[in-house]
């Protein structure tokens, strides 16, 4: 039985040109994590394999950095990065756990920004 749960950073609103960290944490299970995949829609961004380490997809190499931990750092954000990101934990013996994070990237001129983007 799959008893684990995935906690995420939560949805994130960020500014164009900035960087953010996507993180997931698997808890409430003793299952062994064999690999974590990071995906956006149907695109594979990166893989962290327990034995082989990190592999970043070639098309994202310039803007994606591994870590911290099993997380992923996205840099030089563009509005087109807006969308849903998935952390997919492959575990033994439980199977697959998936976490979801929605990233919204805003133009710096957008008025309806979160508090951390507002000019005092």
């Amino acid at each position: 039985m799959m008893t684990g749960t995935i906690e995420t950073t939560g949805n994130i609103s960020a500014e164009k040109g900035g960087s953010i960290i996507l993180q997931c944490h698997l808890s409430s299970t003793t299952a062994q994590v064999t690999q974590v995949n990071w995906e956006q829609q149907d695109q594979l961004l990166a893989i962290c394999n327990a034995d082989l380490g990190w592999h970043i997809s070639p098309s994202f190499k310039d803007r994606v950095a591994p870590g911290p931990g099993l997380g992923l750092t996205l840099q030089s954000l563009t509005v087109n990065d807006t969308g849903e990101y998935f952390c997919i934990y492959h575990t033994y013996p439980d199977g697959t756990y998936t976490g979801r994070i929605f990233l919204e990237v805003l133009e710096s001129s957008v008025a309806e920004h979160g508090a951390r983007f507002q000019i005092p």
């Epitope: 939560g10 949805n11 609103s13 509005v79 807006t82 849903e84 919204e104 957008v110 979160g114 951390r116």
Partner: antibody, heavy 119, light 112 residues
Framework: EVQLQQSGPELVKPGASVKISCKAS????????MNWVKQSHGKNLEWIGL????????SYNQKFKDKASLTFDKSSSTAYMELLSLTSEDSAVYYC????????????WGQGTSVTVSS | DVVVTQTPLSLPVSFGDQVSISCKSS???????????LSWYLHKPGQSPQLLIY???NRFSGVPDRFSGSGSGTNFTLKISTIKPEDLGVYSC?????????FGGGTKLEIK
Amino acid sequence: EVQLQQSGPELVKPGASVKISCKASGYSFTGYTMNWVKQSHGKNLEWIGLIIPYNGGTSYNQKFKDKASLTFDKSSSTAYMELLSLTSEDSAVYYCARGFRGYFAVDYWGQGTSVTVSS
Amino acid sequence: DVVVTQTPLSLPVSFGDQVSISCKSSQSLTNSYGDTYLSWYLHKPGQSPQLLIYGISNRFSGVPDRFSGSGSGTNFTLKISTIKPEDLGVYSCLQGTHQPWTFGGGTKLEIK
């Protein structure tokens, strides 16, 4: 003035599909996400999912992943939701609602489209 | 999914009353950057829902200042300081911090 004009009420048979439209005006359609919300009779609101007109991305509530399909037509500033394999449980009012940038909320709502599934 | 519990289910009021509606979530609605995505809506009979409050406590354009939002973490409150006839309807909170977004069950504000 921001306006979201939805298509009219639908009476459909069980097993059939229906496509609801939501025509946006008064703002840049591609600059905002479009969300869809279900309200069953006398029940609370449920978020179905959203579509991102500027890059074609979608995000679904897994509960509706096999029930709803979200699309859009940039040229007419119209978002669509197709509801598949309808049952009586799908009888409800469906709203489109514009995403409120930076706050993971919605700011403007369509008038709602009533869908009744009955044989 | 995050469960959002709203209380009370029904709230009988008299015009001029001050009322509070509570919204509690099954996990924290503050993301790793310190932002909390909790909004409030009013659904009047025969109309579409309307946004009242976003980001816990920000009033949306045109919303009277008798409406105020507060809270943090998992506990949130909408206060209406002086009830007017146009305030009657169903109030719902929405969390947008975690996928999928989830609404509270609604609170019906009605005349005693």
